[in-house]
């Protein structure tokens, strides 16, 4: 039986400040049963950049319809970057459960933020 | 087309056990979460069982009781049932499940569904 | 659990009229909630998910409105074909799924 896999395509984006900053991530099945989440950074001092159900994120929207069918494409677009934003972003798989269990990651994709052409 | 065909509902006596199975077809079985929901005769509908991969939910009202398994090389979902009670007795309906947005799940193909009648 | 209550239990109703359905949920369920259609001796069958989402073949003269707590399905000009009993189901906080106790429109 096939692994579930998390897919990260890019290792590294670039982008000028001011601008969006779009993350890829793919997921290789529906299954086991579980949410989606992406943090920057990895450890226990991570910080959450996005989750579906719970928390505002004002500057991070999914790339996909979030009504869409059977969605296994969990890209997301941050806006407004600036050099505070750098850092590597992961994508992480989460097992359903009281509380929910870490999964499976991606391997990462690490941000980097030009400065802004003048 | 998505079909999915139930069978292994009959009738039995309190404690005893029985195994139903729903054969699948029309779809990527391997993938995606399957269910059981029930329906007691004259009432409404009762979620009994869900199994992702390896992972497996049920309700309060079968725990330790009914076991949902899997076979993707048969595309078929097992419901084994054991310590059967009068109130076990409904139709068992097989759904496949479908994901929206970033998590949820709700069911957008079901079977015809097998009577399982629990009766001394 | 959240508990899913829905409203009237039966409905009388003529072919042609606006048809509107309530299902409340005992908590904020977000819009994770899908509404099946059952007839008499046969399996459900989606409708409606993510509150306003039809299903594919879904006639237009259904639709779901609502978010929260509150969410309606109105059948715009009901056909005979529509009888039957409607759920509703939540799925923002599983498990347990669970199911509104359905209500019933009879054709008049």
């Known amino acids: 039986e096939e692994e579930l896999q998390v897919i990260q395509p890019e290792k590294s984006v670039s982008v000028a400040a001011g601008d969006s900053a779009t993350l890829n991530c793919t997921v290789s099945s529906l299954i086991p049963v579980g949410p989606i989440q992406w943090f920057r950074g990895a450890g226990p001092g991570r910080e959450l950049i996005y989750n579906l159900k719970e928390g505002h994120f004002p500057r991070v929207t999914p790339v996909s319809d979030p009504t869409k069918r059977n969605n296994m494409d969990f890209s997301i677009r941050i806006s407004n970057i600036t050099p505070a934003d750098a850092g590597t972003y992961y994508c992480v798989k989460f097992r359903k459960g009281s509380p929910d269990v870490e999964l499976k990651s991606g391997a990462g994709t690490e941000l980097s933020v030009r400065a802004k052409p003048s | 087309d998505v079909q999915l065909v139930e069978s292994g509902g009959g009738v039995v006596r309190p404690g005893e056990s029985l195994r139903l199975s729903c054969a699948a077809s029309?779809?990527?079985?391997?993938?995606?979460?399957m269910s059981w929901v029930r329906q007691a005769p004259g009432e409404g509908l009762e979620w009994v069982s869900t199994?992702?991969?390896?992972?497996?939910y049920y309700a309060d009202s079968v725990k330790g009781r009914f076991t949902i398994s899997r076979d993707n090389s048969k595309n078929t979902l097992y419901l084994q049932m054991n310590s059967l009670r009068a109130e076990d007795t409904a139709v068992y309906y097989c759904?496949?499940?479908?994901?929206?947005?970033?998590?949820?799940?709700?069911?957008?193909?079901w079977g015809l569904g097998t009577l399982v009648t629990v009766s001394s | 659990e959240i508990v899913l209550t829905q409203s009237p239990a039966t409905l009388s109703v003529s072919p042609g009229e606006r048809v509107t359905l309530s299902c409340r949920a005992s908590?904020?369920?977000?819009?994770?909630i899908a509404w099946y259609q059952q007839k008499p001796g046969q399996a459900p069958r989606l409708l409606i998910y993510?509150?306003?989402s039809r299903d594919t073949g879904i006639p237009a003269r259904f639709s779901g409105s609502g978010s929260g707590t509150d969410f309606t399905l109105t059948i715009s000009s009901l056909q005979s074909e529509d009888f039957g009993v409607y759920y509703c189901?939540?799925?923002?906080?599983?498990?347990?799924?669970?199911f509104g106790g359905g209500t019933k429109v009879e054709i008049k």
């Open positions: 759904a496949k499940d479908s994901t929206v947005g970033w998590s949820g799940d709700f069911f957008d193909y």
């Open positions: 029309g779809f990527s079985f391997s993938i995606y979460a």
């Open positions: 199994i992702g991969a390896d992972d497996t």
């Open positions: 908590q904020n369920v977000r819009s994770d």
């Open positions: 993510a509150a306003s």
């Open positions: 189901q939540q799925y923002y906080d599983w498990p347990p799924f669970t």
